[in-house]
């Protein structure tokens, strides 16, 4: 029961992260004017991954596309391309672990199969929450590093009688959703990995066969293959000698832990 | 197309409160846009007081944000200005304007002359 | 508070010929993230209240003849009337919609020589 409740809640947890990786991408506010000094403006400039708008205090709004590729800054490219990826990995993370689902049956599928998918879709959502946590850690030192520097620029070169305001930016909220989306993904991802280690079945409950070989018999036992997970050992793949050949019967069956779910 | 129509008494006296209201035709003050008052004094150039934006938050001129109030009353799609402690430097012409793209007034109210006078 | 300083106070110019009206603020009303000119040109007649003209400090307003245009950017900006009608006869006024309070210049009177 612990082990569909871990799979349910990282699926519902990664799930929750994922559209707040979509909704932070898409977001305009990832770099907002920065209102310390003037805390009532008459236009305010914030900016997105995609976009840049101006909000009028009289209730104007315009938004502009970045509609060049090349003259756009090289980090902000690879802050795209980091929430992209992010979301590709979480989307295929949120389809491969629709199928791993525990309380979901499609046809005949074992549980070392679902085990094998839920660890998948487990690193895809790590991958996917770190891709986040790195894209939104980019934007920010670059718009630290750009803040200090306007600050800088703006107590030189007043000598002349006219002043220039210049615009400094700073953190928007799309910032604070993709960490905490990252945060959630990054954590519903190692939810779906612990489950997996339940799920992989430690002995499975089939019927050993007996080959009956001249000499001696020997009972082939199959073991539960942890389904590749590197969690455990594999030593459960034992060949069962004793004196003389068993019926089906006699040998002992151990029964999943699975099965009382 | 948004019209608006200034409305209120002429003639203040010193130290009283001047209250004005401006009745809007044909859009709704919640719907968007700012709605200001300026103020022209007779043969002077103009001055704007102040504005109550379509979700209600209002900004003022520093010079007479102690003496003014600028509310609103949805209700019958009006705003009001409010100048306490008035004197005679505050005769003036009192327009009413939207503001909108460029922060620019496009539409004004035809005005209306306050003298204060005892 | 930005200062928006108008020149001339007045001009005279014939029917027909062009008239340039200059402004100038104590601040660059130029916004970095759109940049735009927030500067507005308007009109007024006596006894009426002002009209827009100009936005953004080149955008004319629908319906404002052409022969109307803004230039300038930063702190330095001009409004011309190419050929001056007996109808433009009026007073300009410069205003600030960069920076709170919105300020306007003292006006420019525009008549005919």
């Known amino acids: 029961m612990a082990v569909t409740a871990c799979q349910g809640l990282g699926f519902v947890v990664s799930l929750i992260g994922i559209a707040g990786i979509i909704a932070a991408t898409c977001m305009d506010q990832w770099s907002t004017q920065d209102l310390y000094n003037n805390p009532v403006t008459a236009v305010f400039n914030y900016q997105g991954l995609w976009r840049s708008c101006v909000r009028e205090s009289s209730g104007f709004t315009e938004c502009r596309g970045y509609f060049t590729l090349l003259g756009l800054p090289a980090m902000l490219q690879a802050v795209r391309a980091l929430m992209i990826v992010g979301i590709v990995l979480g989307a295929i993370g949120l389809l491969v672990s629709i199928f791993a689902l525990k309380c979901i049956r499609i046809g005949s599928m074992e549980d070392s199969a679902k085990a094998n998918m839920t660890l998948t879709s487990g690193i895809m959502f790590i991958v996917s929450g770190l891709c986040a946590i790195a894209g939104v850690s980019v934007f920010a030192n670059m718009l630290v590093t750009n803040f200090w520097m306007s600050t800088a620029n703006m107590y030189t070169g007043m000598g002349g009688m006219v002043q220039t305001v210049q615009t400094r930016y700073t953190f928007g909220a799309a910032l604070f959703v993709g960490w905490v989306a990252g945060g959630l993904t990054l954590i519903g991802g190692v939810m779906m990995c612990i489950a997996c280690r339940g799920l992989a079945p430690e002995e499975t409950n089939y019927k050993a066969v007996s080959y009956h070989a001249s000499g001696h018999s020997v009972a082939y036992k199959p073991g539960g293959f942890k389904a590749s997970t590197g969690f455990g050992s594999n030593t459960k793949n034992k060949k069962i000698y004793d004196g003389g050949a068993r019926t089906e019967d006699e040998v002992q069956s151990y029964p999943s832990k699975h099965d009382y779910v | 197309q948004v019209q608006l129509q200034e409305s209120g008494p002429g003639l203040v006296k010193p130290s009283e409160t001047l209250s004005l209201t401006c009745t809007v035709s044909g859009y709704s003050i919640t719907s968007n846009y700012a709605w200001n008052w300026i103020r022209q004094p007779p043969g002077k150039g103009l001055e704007w007081i102040g504005y109550?934006?379509?979700?209600?938050?209002?900004n003022y001129n520093p010079s007479l944000k102690s003496r003014v109030t600028i509310s609103r009353d949805t209700s019958k799609n009006q705003f009001s200005l409010k100048l306490s402690s008035v004197t005679a430097a505050d005769t003036a012409v009192y327009y009413c304007?939207?503001?909108?793209?460029?922060?620019?007034?496009?539409?004004w109210g035809q005005g209306t002359l306050v003298t204060v006078s005892s | 508070d930005i200062v928006m300083t108008q020149s001339p106070d007045s001009l005279a110019v014939s029917l027909g010929e062009r008239a340039t009206i200059n402004c100038k603020s104590s601040?660059?009303?130029?916004?970095?993230?759109?940049?735009?000119?927030?500067l507005t040109w308007y009109q007024q007649k006596p006894g009426q209240p002002p009209k827009l003209l100009i936005y953004?400090?080149?955008t004319r307003e629908s319906g404002v003849p052409d022969r109307f245009s803004g230039s300038g950017s930063g702190t330095d900006f001009t409004l011309t009337i190419s050929s001056l009608q007996a109808e433009d006869v009026a007073v300009y006024y410069c205003q600030n919609a960069y920076s709170f309070p919105w300020t306007f210049g003292q006006g420019t009177k525009v008549e005919i020589k």
């Open positions: 953004w400090a080149s």
């Open positions: 601040q660059s009303l130029l916004n970095s993230g759109n940049q735009k000119n927030y």
């Open positions: 109550i934006n379509y979700s209600g938050n209002t």
């Open positions: 304007a939207t503001s909108y793209y460029g922060n620019s007034f496009i539409y």
